[in-house]
């Protein structure tokens, strides 16, 4: 028999999503207005291009990157788009409320949209750990909680540690990774007998996942430079990110071959390791003074990524129930930490260069910032995981994990796949 959405979810999802959308529309109506001072139309177009790059990364890049499951590729791409669309709306409001609201209405600029898209990207990174095991109603909850947690984290870090937009957004890698892993830890883990084939990758979806990786690879320099405030910072960020991702591609492909007894290249390793350099240089991409340093970072990041992809999936599958192909979570957690360590090294150099005797204090502040990001990610992730386990969401039965047919109408299929 063809699998349908359970009746209760069929009632619950549209009601839940549309009520939320109506609430968002009302909030936009009462509390927002456009920036009226956009006088330079050419500048407007240039500014929009950055936002466009970020949207391509999110919708196509992360959408397709997570689509490698044999029987869950449709859901991966479309659910990602759904979460992005919802996440951006909520992030624009939340950022406005947190940063501008005391002065009256929230002013929406192209920068607001850029910032909101990056916040929503956090959810798309995290969700890789749980896609296939949750329905859309649950994903709505995840979007709301994660975007709220990230927005508040950024505000706290900005106020306490005096960091700019770029610096506090670059915690996104570590935050998203730990958030996703902690949500996954809360969800039912064992895959019942007979469904193991569903979380395997297939050739066509793997090709689309590679396409996603390529889009991310092409636009990662835009992501790392999007929130920087001066042309020189952006130029450095673009160059350094490009060098780092270029080297991590070479490292990923050769390292993957090296890691295999027969010297074969693993698609899964490559999907994620090609991005390794971009994640590792994220925090300090505008500060790295020369290309060779960015390239060395890309090399190290590629090796870490391939090593992690080889040895961590077993552990993650047992403990967190994350399938072998969903390696973004632990990949980003390791590489995000590497990026933060690089920044701490730069901070030490800065403090020494200034002849400042407060090295310990500065490093402690930076470690405090990172720890805060991890703690908030873990706590909000666990909270989300607990919420997602509530019966009201009518989560897919374990036997229906990684199954597009639970969610999609396939007219050409009477039964099964």
């Amino acid at each position: 028999m063809s699998s349908k959405y359970p009746r209760s979810v069929r009632r619950c999802l549209p009601l839940w999503a549309l009520t939320l959308e109506a609430a968002l529309i009302l909030l936009f109506y009462f509390f927002t207005h456009y920036d009226a001072s956009l006088e330079d139309q050419k500048g407007l177009v240039a500014s929009y291009q950055v936002g466009q790059d970020l949207t391509v990364m999110a919708a196509i890049g992360l959408g397709f990157l997570t689509s490698s499951f044999r029987r869950h590729s449709w859901s991966s791409v479309a659910f990602n788009l759904f979460m992005l669309a919802l996440g951006v709306q909520w992030a624009i409001l939340l950022d406005g409320f947190l940063s501008q609201f005391p002065s009256g209405k929230v002013v929406i600029t192209l920068f607001s949209i850029r910032l909101a898209t990056m916040s929503a990207l956090s959810v798309l990174i995290s969700v890789d750990a749980v896609l296939g095991k949750v329905n859309l109603a649950q994903l709505v909850v995840m979007v709301l909680v994660e975007v709220t947690a990230l927005g508040n984290l950024r505000m706290v870090i900005s106020n306490i540690f005096n960091t700019d937009y770029h610096m506090n957004m670059m915690h996104i890698y570590v935050f998203a990774a730990y958030f996703g892993l902690s949500v996954a830890w809360c969800l039912p883990k064992p895959l019942p007998e007979g469904t193991e084939d569903k979380d395997q990758t297939a050739t066509i979806p793997s090709l689309s996942a590679m396409l996603g990786a390529l889009f991310l690879w092409m636009f990662w320099p835009s992501f790392n430079s999007a929130l920087l405030r001066s042309p020189i910072e952006r130029k450095n960020a673009v160059f350094n990110t490009y060098y780092a991702v270029a080297v991590s591609v070479v490292t990923a492909i050769s390292g993957s071959s090296l890691a295999h007894p027969q010297g074969k290249i693993s698609k899964t390793y490559v999907h994620s390791a090609v991005l390794a350099g971009g994640v590792a240089v994220g925090t300090s991409c505008h500060l790295i003074p020369s290309p060779w340093l960015a390239m060395v970072l890309g090399l190290v990041a590629g090796l870490i990524s391939v090593g992690g992809a080889k040895y961590l999936p077993g552990c993650c599958n047992r403990v967190l129930g994350i399938p072998h192909s969903s390696i973004m979570g632990y990949n980003f957690s390791l590489l995000g930490l590497l990026g933060e360590i690089i920044y701490i090294v730069l901070l030490v150099l800065d403090t020494v260069g200034a002849g400042n005797g407060m090295i310990g204090f500065q490093v402690l502040l930076s470690i405090g910032e990172l720890s805060l990001a991890i703690v908030i990610a873990l706590m909000s992730g666990l909270l989300t995981g607990l919420l997602l386990n509530l019966k009201i969401w009518k989560a897919p039965h374990e036997a229906k994990y990684f199954d597009d047919q639970v969610f999609w109408k396939f007219p050409h299929l009477a039964v099964g796949f």
Partner: antibody
Framework: QVQLVESGGGVVQPGTSLRLSCAAS????????MHWVRQAPGKGLEWVAY????????YYADSVKGRFTISRDNSKSTLNLQMNSLRAEDTAVYYC??????????????????WGQGTLVTVSS | DIQLTQSPSSLSASVGDRVTITCRAS??????LNWYQQKPGKAPKLLIS???SLQSGVPSRFSGSGSGTDFTLTISSLQREDYATYYC??????????FGQGTKLEIK
């Protein structure tokens, strides 16, 4: 050489509006962040507003938030400050200033390397 | 917001004197501090960036030092054209970019 020329100052009543402009020349305007800084008579310097080089992001001092709007037209190399709901305490000489960024190890240092001659705004009933 | 406190708020000195102005930040700002000079009726002029980097065209009698929370501007041998008001400004945090309240240097 770098030149910044402010205009639009004058005497206005409280609650009214005024628009200041700053015409830039001698450098590539579109590649620099720009600021407005003011100085009340006999007082120190107070930073007012800042706009990114591409106009995509803006910051304001708490004292002017919601009343002042900074904008720029890179095609005309002009910086503007729209001042609404003016108060007596907004009386000051308003300077536009160009921002320079230079790289440190762990963050960039920003400073104002060029200033205009200033334009006086007097808010009085 | 980071607060900057300059001392003294005014001082009198003679030509040839060595003058020191201090600026204290409410929290560590590493070396992200700039010094400006302003003469009456004129716009401010950048003297020193990054606590100790002298700008081109600024006489070498001006020097800056310090890091963390305590900074100093020193004029090794005061000249007549140095009588002005001096401001420190931090750019460690995101805007607002606070200035010190100023130090007025007068002829004795």
């Amino acid at each position: 050489q770098v030149q910044l020329v402010e205009s639009g100052g004058g005497v206005v009543q409280p609650g009214t509006s005024l628009r200041l402009s700053c015409a830039a020349s001698g450098f590539t305007f579109r590649t620099y962040g720009m600021h407005w800084v003011r100085q009340a008579p006999g007082k120190g310097l107070e930073w007012v507003a800042y706009i990114w080089y591409d106009g995509s992001n803006k910051y304001y001092a708490d004292s002017v938030k919601g009343r002042f709007t900074i904008s720029r037209d890179n095609s005309k190399s002009t910086l503007n400050l729209q001042m609404n709901s003016l108060r007596a305490e907004d009386t000051a000489v308003y300077y536009c200033a160009r921002e320079i960024a230079s790289r440190g190890y762990s963050r960039y240092l920003y400073y104002f390397d060029s200033w205009g001659q200033g334009t006086l705004v007097t808010v009085s009933s | 917001d980071i607060q900057l406190t300059q001392s003294p708020s005014s001082l009198s000195a003679s030509v040839g004197d060595r003058v020191t102005i201090t600026c204290r930040a409410s929290q560590s700002i590493s070396s992200y501090l700039n010094w400006y000079q302003q003469k009456p009726g004129k716009a401010p002029k950048l003297l020193i960036s990054a606590a100790s980097s002298l700008q081109s065209g600024v006489p070498s009698r001006f020097s800056g030092s310090g890091s963390g929370t305590d900074f100093t501007l020193t004029i090794s041998s005061l000249q007549r054209e140095d009588y002005a008001t001096y401001y420190c400004q931090q750019s460690y945090s995101t805007p607002p970019y606070t200035f010190g309240q100023g130090t007025k240097l007068e002829i004795k």
